[in-house]
């Protein structure tokens, strides 16, 4: 099939980085500046992506591949191919419509992105809290209360309810 197609369509012989130039009897011409073609047989080259504003160039556009962008410091990538940049927050915070907000009591976020998540409920696994949770860190569960030596005690807080207004946006 490939051989048949190339006999019928000279454009199929044009490699990536070129286009099939109709103005020149379908000769394969190199893509012009600021453009690329990632596959063979293309009749036009695609315009290179420009990493502007909050986007930063990770790799410039070549003749066969589009430019790759990431985000400037203080932002992180979202979406396929870093199609969006979202503001970073501090650990112990989450991004809402009103900006970065501290995690409510009983929730934590150990990253600069994403939402605050509830602390692990140790009692669901029959365990006790060994280290209390913070806004930045989950609780650390320890042995079950029955395994503790006499006189030792632990506190297992109730599973928190998320406060209204702090849900992920």
């Amino acid at each position: 099939f490939e051989r048949t197609r190339s006999l019928q369509d000279p454009c199929s012989n044009c490699p990536a980085g070129t286009f099939c130039d109709n103005n020149r009897n379908q000769i394969c011409s190199p893509c012009p500046p600021n453009s690329f073609s990632s596959a063979g047989g293309q009749r036009t080259c695609d315009i290179c992506r420009q990493c502007k504003g909050v986007f930063r160039t990770r790799k410039e556009c070549s003749s066969t591949s589009n430019a790759e962008c990431d985000c400037t410091p203080g932002f992180h990538c979202l979406g396929a191919g870093c199609s969006m940049c979202e503001q970073d927050c501090k650990q112990g915070q989450e991004l809402t419509k009103k900006g970065c907000k501290d995690c409510c009591f009983g929730t934590f976020n150990d990253q600069k992105r994403g939402i605050c998540r509830p602390w692990t409920n140790c009692s669901l696994d029959g365990k006790s809290v060994l280290v209390n949770g913070t806004k930045e860190r989950d609780v650390v569960c320890g042995p079950s209360p029955a395994d503790l030596s006499p006189g030792a005690s632990s506190v297992t807080p109730p599973a928190p309810a998320r406060e209204p207004g702090h849900s992920p946006q």
């Epitope: 130039d21 103005n23 190199p30 012009p32 790799k59 410039e60 556009c61 003749s63």
Partner: antibody, heavy 119, light 108 residues
Framework: QEQLQESGPGLVKPSQTLSLTCTVS??????????WSWIRQHPGKGLEWIGY???????YYNPSLERRVAISLDTSKNQFSLNLNSVTVADTAVYYC???????????WGQGTLVTVSS | SYVLTQPPSVSVAPGQTARMTCGGD??????VHWYQQKAGQAPVLVVY???DRPSGIPDRFSGSNSGNTATLTISRVAAGDEADYYC???????????FGGGTKLTVL
């Protein structure tokens, strides 16, 4: 495949204007958005980019030369030209014309022409 | 403006591997092209887009690019490879073409 050929006087007097023309064959100079460039090489030295022009007539020049240089297009003749004024002996060099394609790649090049500045 | 730095000379025995470097600030994000220029001739493209070869260039020629250094490697060097080699980028910030100073490859 495009071919490029430089032409112009091989000898220029100091303080005069150096004028070179590049003739493009095998393709149209005003199609596809290519950039058309001049590059020079002083005897025994490295390559020095002079500037380029593209089909809209917009041009970019090496900052060290931009006060003295002008590149122009003549699409009717499929040519582009270099004018470098107020030349001195330091402008003696081989001058190349070339095409710039995707990612700034320079391909093809002309064969080059030696221009000597001397009285 | 953007600056590319190349060592003035590299020497290698026939059959050995020659490596020529091209230094530039964060050059790894840029696209690097390499040209070979033999005495009295126009430059010829030998590697483009960091590591691609034009048709007709032997696979002994290869390129790499990361961090602050791009490298042109010629394996199984032959006497005919003796030439000057130039790296080149397009500085998108200024829209200027930038050449390195060139490296003279001597085959011992």
């Amino acid at each position: 495949q495009e071919q490029l050929q430089e032409s112009g006087p091989g000898l220029v007097k100091p303080s005069q204007t150096l004028s070179l023309t590049c003739t493009v064959s095998g393709g149209s100079i005003n199609s596809q958005g290519y950039y058309w460039s001049w590059i020079r090489q002083h005897p025994g030295k490295g390559l020095e980019w002079i500037g380029y022009i593209y089909d809209s007539g917009s041009a970019y020049y090496n900052p060290s030369l931009e006060r003295r240089v002008a590149i122009s297009l003549d699409t009717s003749k499929n040519q582009f030209s270099l004018n470098l004024n107020s030349v001195t002996v330091a402008d003696t060099a081989v001058y190349y014309c070339a095409r710039i394609v995707a990612a700034g790649r320079i391909d093809p090049w002309g064969q080059g022409t030696l221009v000597t500045v001397s009285s | 403006s953007y600056v590319l730095t190349q060592p003035p000379s590299v020497s290698v025995a026939p059959g050995q591997t020659a490596r020529m470097t091209c230094g530039g600030d964060n050059i790894g994000i840029k696209i690097v092209h390499w040209y070979q220029q033999k005495a009295g001739q126009a430059p010829v493209l030998v590697v483009y887009d960091d590591n691609d070869r034009p048709s007709g260039i032997p696979d002994r020629f290869s390129g790499s690019n990361s961090g602050n250094t791009a490298t042109l490697t010629i394996s199984r060097v032959a006497a005919g490879d003796e030439a000057d080699y130039y790296c080149q980028v397009w500085d998108r910030r200024s829209d200027h073409v930038v050449f390195g100073g060139g490296t003279k490859l001597t085959v011992l």
